[in-house]
């Protein structure tokens, strides 16, 4: 999906009002410096691409993020504020329903959510100084 035509300010507002808090809740008890940055993004569409990938694509050691509160709110925000996003996600959602629903917070998941926090911060960053 091409995130170029999303309403970035509306997504930013959704992040600031709820998604950010849910990410903090998930990470509670974890030091903010515990994980180094291993993923970055270079503009708002790119950030959303990487956020979608980390939030909804199962990875080795962390297959369970899509059912978390922050993930569901992320999905809702993208569905509302990114034209045509919902249609592209129907097949992915059906595939996800077939997986086992076992809620385990692994260290790998914590690391992944830490990377998500970094990506969201970059998405919401103010304009950089004139370099």
């Amino acid at each position: 999906y091409d995130f170029t035509n999303c309403d970035f300010e509306k997504i930013k507002a959704a992040y600031l009002s709820t998604i950010s808090k849910d990410l903090i809740t998930y990470m509670s008890g974890t030091k903010s410096t515990e994980f180094n940055n291993t993923v970055s993004c270079s503009n708002r569409p790119h950030c959303l691409t990487e956020i979608q990938s980390l939030t909804f694509n199962p990875t080795a050691g962390c297959a369970s993020l899509a059912k978390e509160m922050f993930a569901m709110k992320t999905k809702a925000a993208l569905a509302i504020w990114c034209p045509g996003y919902s249609e592209t996600q129907i097949n992915a959602t059906q595939a996800m329903k077939k997986r086992r629903k076992r809620k385990v917070t692994t260290n790998k998941c914590l690391e992944q959510v830490s990377q998500l926090q970094g990506l969201w911060r970059r998405f919401n960053r103010p304009l950089l100084k004139q370099q």
């Epitope: 940055n37 291993t38 993923v39 970055s40 993004c41 270079s42 503009n43 790119h46 990487e50 970059r122 960053r125 950089l128 100084k129 004139q130 370099q131």
Partner: antibody
Framework: QMQLVESGGGVVQPGRSLRLSCAAS????????MHWVRQAPGKGLEWVAV????????HYADSVKGRFTITRDNSKNTLNLQMNSLRAEDTAVYYC???????????????WGQGTMVTVSS | SYVLTQPPSVSVAPGQTARITCGGN??????VHWYQQKPGQAPVLVVY???DRPSWIPERFSGSNSGNTATLTISRGEAGDEADYYC???????????FGGGTKLTVL
Amino acid sequence: QMQLVESGGGVVQPGRSLRLSCAASGFTFRTYGMHWVRQAPGKGLEWVAVVWYDGYDTHYADSVKGRFTITRDNSKNTLNLQMNSLRAEDTAVYYCSRSPQWEDIFESMDIWGQGTMVTVSS
Amino acid sequence: SYVLTQPPSVSVAPGQTARITCGGNNLGSKSVHWYQQKPGQAPVLVVYDDSDRPSWIPERFSGSNSGNTATLTISRGEAGDEADYYCQVWDMSSDLVVFGGGTKLTVL
């Protein structure tokens, strides 16, 4: 463990070519800008070139423009520097480094390799 | 092209504060990054975006940037801080990375 490992250095005669490689691991390579920086013996750091996170664009120092080419292969997590028409003044340790990028601005170089030595001598 | 100027050397007594400067035209409008390099080793990022510090760098390292000068401050200097220090910016007008000439810090 995030890591950059350079290879391909060696001794080469003036006017000849050499290709350096940098293997990345432990991070999502395709999301970072990548640089080559060099350091001549006893001298300071000199930036050589940078390639965008997606390979879309490249920038070069005037001292190497037209002679060096920076490329990347995001499917293999590798960065390359093709060095042609080498000169004695290209003798240096060559480091690769990663840099977060925002739009067309490159940020700090937060991870560096250990470097590979290139000696240009007849 | 854009030029960054650093003093070739700075000395500090153990436990005292060292300040390394980096000068450039209207430097305060740019984000400055600082690197530490010990002999035979690769550079290490110690301060980025003027004053932010990577998680692995001690709080003794801090930075500031305004006007035409950026400053790297190392408080409570230790023997292990002896190294070369380089400032760096991205020059958007020319799409080039620029490094300062480097400053050799000696802990007396």
